[in-house]
Interface confidence: low
Amino acid sequence: EVEKTACPSGKKAREIDESLIFYKKWELEACVDAALLATQMDRVNAIPFTYEQLDVLKHKLDELYPQGYPESVIQHLGYLFLKMSPEDIRKWNVTSLETLKALLEVNKGHEMSPQVATLIDRFVKGRGQLDKDTLDTLTAFYPGYLCSLSPEELSSVPPSSIWAVRPQDLDTCDPRQLDVLYPKARLAFQNMNGSEYFVKIQSFLGGAPTEDLKALSQQNVSMDLATFMKLRTDAVLPLTVAEVQKLLGPHVEGLKAEERHRPVRDWILRQRQDDLDTLGLGLQGGIPNGYLVLDLSMQEALS
């Protein structure tokens, strides 16, 4: 077969248009000027190139920009972004939120790929912090994004950004992450009145300390059992039966169904049985009447 290197007569690309989809890979390589491609990248996404053809286009851009693509090209990569490796992306300097959105749109509906994770990392590091607009964008595309960050990374989230967080964004967060996010949320929502405050803070309560739970119990918040079950066990244990009853309001009846699960199980073991009996729920496992309760944490502190 003839060596396929020279561009056939009359096939030199004058612009990036739909005629190129009929070019074989070797023709694209031979007939498309890399600089022309770079200046007309916005057209590529509208043309149904095969994945093999996209490989050729990527190769041409790699040759033109060995140190990494400029943002003017990155913003218009479209489906070509799916061809990039994390190593390619580490060379980029992405500063525009519009560029980030354009590339996230390409990956929409798919799980976060290593490429996307690298892109986000480059973008956030470039900005210095997870500002509200960025967080808004990232959680819109990846509801679980926030919970994929380490506590250290979450510490760069400014309290103002917490307004962008939706309850579902925190579904997969573990207690260590909520420990970091809760104080920020408390600060962000501090000027709201009681009932509005509780609605906003509810998703973050897995990071709340005992004192804050005690304070909430005085505000008729009627916490649901699902939220209660996500509270830190060490924050729930010191609560009295009366405080839990006020915290849960009408939902207190749900404790019976959860009496074998943490944190309810551990909390029951710390309560006097006659205090539990006042709830009328038949909760069992409390400290029998007449037994002395020792606060072991206090004992350890003294020794």
């Epitope: 396929k4 009929f22 149904p48 190139f49 095969t50 093999e52 996209l54």
Partner: antibody, heavy 122, light 106 residues
Framework: EVQLVQSGAEVKKPGASVKVSCKAS????????VHWVRQAPGQGLEWMGI????????TYAQKFQGRVTMTRDTSTSTVYMELSSLRSEDTAVYYC???????????????WGQGTLVTVSS | SYELTQPPSVSVSPGQTASITCSGD??????ASWYQQKPGQSPVLVIY???RRPSGIPERFSGSNSGNTATLTISGTQAMDEADYYC?????????FGTGTKVTVL
């Protein structure tokens, strides 16, 4: 699964025109190119032309230039093929075929309509 | 105008290999596709881009394309493979179909 549903059989007189429609059940139909191909009784497949996703660009086989018009109504996900100045040799089954493809493969027709029989007879 | 030529018919015994050729000027420089058509049915794409199989097409169908000839190979041919087969390529703004080959499973 995406299906292309074509309009019913037609009987036309020589010199008349026929307009065949092709409607997709999938909601992403407007993203793809659509071909029209015909097959005379007992004969092979013959390509007639192609229309792009937005409907603004068409390419017709030289044999049908001036007689065929392909249009697209993106609001109803329907593509139309109109053939004028009919003659008896235009009697054929007319197929629409979509370029859906794996990996943006443009070069083949991978979703086909059930075909519309057009009979031209005096 | 560009032409693709196929043998009118190919006969094969069940379980054997059937090869259908498609000839055209410098066909290897173009992408070849293959379609299967059973009586009274619409064509079905079995090979695209020379040698790629769409999902749902059995592995016994394979393709190659070089020089002036594209070939569709059916390994371990089954009775259900009896049909007309058409090659197709693109040339200068035109899609061209081959003349068609009737495959008979004896």
């Amino acid at each position: 699964e995406v299906q292309l549903v074509q309009s019913g059989a037609e009987v036309k007189k020589p010199g008349a025109s026929v307009k065949v429609s092709c409607k997709a059940s999938g909601d992403t139909f407007n993203r793809y190119y659509v071909h029209w191909v015909r097959q005379a009784p007992g004969q092979g497949l013959e390509w007639m032309g192609i229309i792009n996703p937005s409907g603004v660009s068409t390419t017709y086989a030289q044999k049908f230039q001036g007689r065929v018009t392909m249009t697209r109504d993106t609001s109803t996900s329907t593509v139309y093929m109109e053939l004028s100045s009919l003659r008896s040799e235009d009697t054929a089954v007319y197929y629409c075929a979509e370029v859906r493809g794996s990996g943006y493969n443009y070069f083949a027709m991978d979703v086909w309509g059930q075909g519309t029989l057009v009979t031209v007879s005096s | 105008s560009y032409e693709l030529t196929q043998p009118p018919s190919v006969s094969v015994s069940p379980g054997q290999t059937a090869s259908i050729t498609c000839s055209g000027d410098k066909l290897g420089d173009k992408y070849a596709s293959w379609y299967q058509q059973k009586p009274g049915q619409s064509p079905v794409l079995v090979i695209y881009q020379d040698n790629r199989r769409p999902s749902g097409i059995p592995e016994r169908f394979s393709g190659s394309n070089s020089g002036n000839t594209a070939t569709l190979t059916i390994s371990g041919t089954q009775a259900m493979d009896e049909a007309d087969y058409y090659c197709q390529a693109w040339d200068s703004d035109t899609y061209v179909f081959g003349t068609g080959t009737k495959v008979t499973v004896l």
